[in-house]
Interface confidence: low
């Protein structure tokens, strides 16, 4: 899916109001220095591509995050604010349902969600490298203490 035509400000608002808090809840009890952020993204469409991949694609050691509250809200935000996104996810959703058994929070999942937090923070500051931080206040950093 090409995320170029998404309404990024609406997605950002959804993240700041709800998704960020659900990510924090998921990570509660984890030390902020426990995981290094190894996944990055260069612009908003790229960030959403990486966010979608980490949130919805099963990985070794973390079978499915897709039924976590932050994931459901991420999918809702993308489906509302990214034209045509829902249609592209139908087959992926079916595969996800078949794979879903029970929610188990593994260390690998915690690491993956830590990466997600970094991607979302980057999504909220897409021009940071080019323009410094004057145009993009770190609205979400008051909630997060992970280094990135």
């Amino acid at each position: 899916y090409d995320f170029t035509n998404c309404d990024f400000e609406k997605i950002k608002a959804a993240y700041l109001s709800t998704i960020s808090k659900d990510l924090i809840t998921y990570m509660s009890g984890t030390k902020s220095t426990e995981f290094n952020n190894t996944v990055s993204c260069s612009n908003r469409p790229h960030c959403l591509t990486e966010i979608q991949s980490l949130t919805f694609n099963p990985t070794a050691g973390c079978a499915s995050l897709a039924k976590e509250m932050f994931a459901m809200k991420t999918k809702a935000a993308l489906a509302i604010w990214c034209p045509g996104y829902s249609e592209t996810q139908i087959n992926a959703t079916q595969a996800m349902k078949k794979a879903r058994k029970s929610k188990v929070t593994t260390n690998k999942c915690l690491e993956q969600v830590s990466q997600l937090q970094g991607l979302w923070r980057r999504f909220n500051r897409p021009l940071l490298k080019q323009q410094g931080s004057s145009d993009y206040k770190d609205d979400d950093d008051k909630h997060h203490h992970h280094h990135h």
Epitope: A14, S17, K75, A79, I80, G84, E87, Q89, I90, Q94
Partner: antibody, heavy 121, light 105 residues
């Protein structure tokens, strides 16, 4: 069992507003979207807009933008559709329709019974 | 806005016959949904995402298509199948087709 129960029929004068409610039960209200669709007599179905109950996010059909407002009361598991500046061509049956975004096709899988709104002077 | 054109507007057939309903989009869409509506009732989902049967829908209903052309087929019409059928897409806005009325010949 998923149920969407809508408020009763309304008769309004041109220029007035109408607010239709849709009470949801049988599922977690904040997990899914709510669409509003209308159907004028003998006409096709017409999508008006969608709301995400968990945070109130909305997307509207441009045709209705500025005249329609979608809201939810999470505590009451109820969605609302308010249409303002009514005109005679707004006479229609108005439906709420749940959309489960974790369901194949993302289509509208459960519908309310419909609310008839008549606009007449 | 993507416009959906359904044809024919009316299909007059007898029980036991095969019904083929067409839905054409003004530009390419990924999937098509189909609904059935009877007088005085809300629409009922039939087919999700082009070809997936909704819950409780008999196997005589099937859907196919891609791009701009989609088809709903009822292999053998039963008395309860006489109704209006709508296609629906979602690209950015949802839109519905104008409907095909399947009536008893």
């Amino acid at each position: 069992e998923v149920q969407l129960v809508q408020s009763g029929a309304e008769v309004k004068k041109p220029g007035a507003s109408v607010k239709v409610s849709c009470k949801a039960s049988g599922y977690t209200f904040t997990d899914d979207y709510m669409n509003w669709v209308r159907q004028a007599p003998g006409q096709r179905l017409e999508w008006m807009g969608i709301i995400s109950p968990y945070n109130g996010g909305t997307s509207y059909n441009q045709k209705f933008k500025g005249r329609v407002t979608l809201t939810v009361d999470k505590s009451a598991s109820t969605a609302y559709m308010e249409l303002s500046s009514l005109r005679s061509e707004d006479t229609a049956v108005y439906y709420c329709a749940r959309e489960d975004y974790d369901y194949d096709g993302y289509a509208m899988d459960h519908w309310g019974q419909g609310t008839t709104v008549t606009v007449s002077s | 806005e993507i416009v959906l054109t359904q044809s024919p507007a009316t299909l007059s057939l007898s029980p036991g016959e095969r019904a083929t309903l067409s839905c054409r989009a003004s530009s390419s869409v990924s999937y098509m949904h189909w609904y059935q509506q009877k007088p005085g009732q809300a629409p009922r989902p039939l087919i999700y995402a082009t070809s997936n049967l909704a819950s409780g829908i008999p196997a005589r209903f099937s859907g196919s298509g891609s791009g701009t052309d989609y088809t709903l087929t009822i292999s053998r019409l039963e008395p309860e199948d006489f109704a209006v059928y709508y296609c629906q897409q979602w690209s950015s806005n949802r839109t519905f087709g104008g409907g095909t009325k399947v009536e008893i010949k």
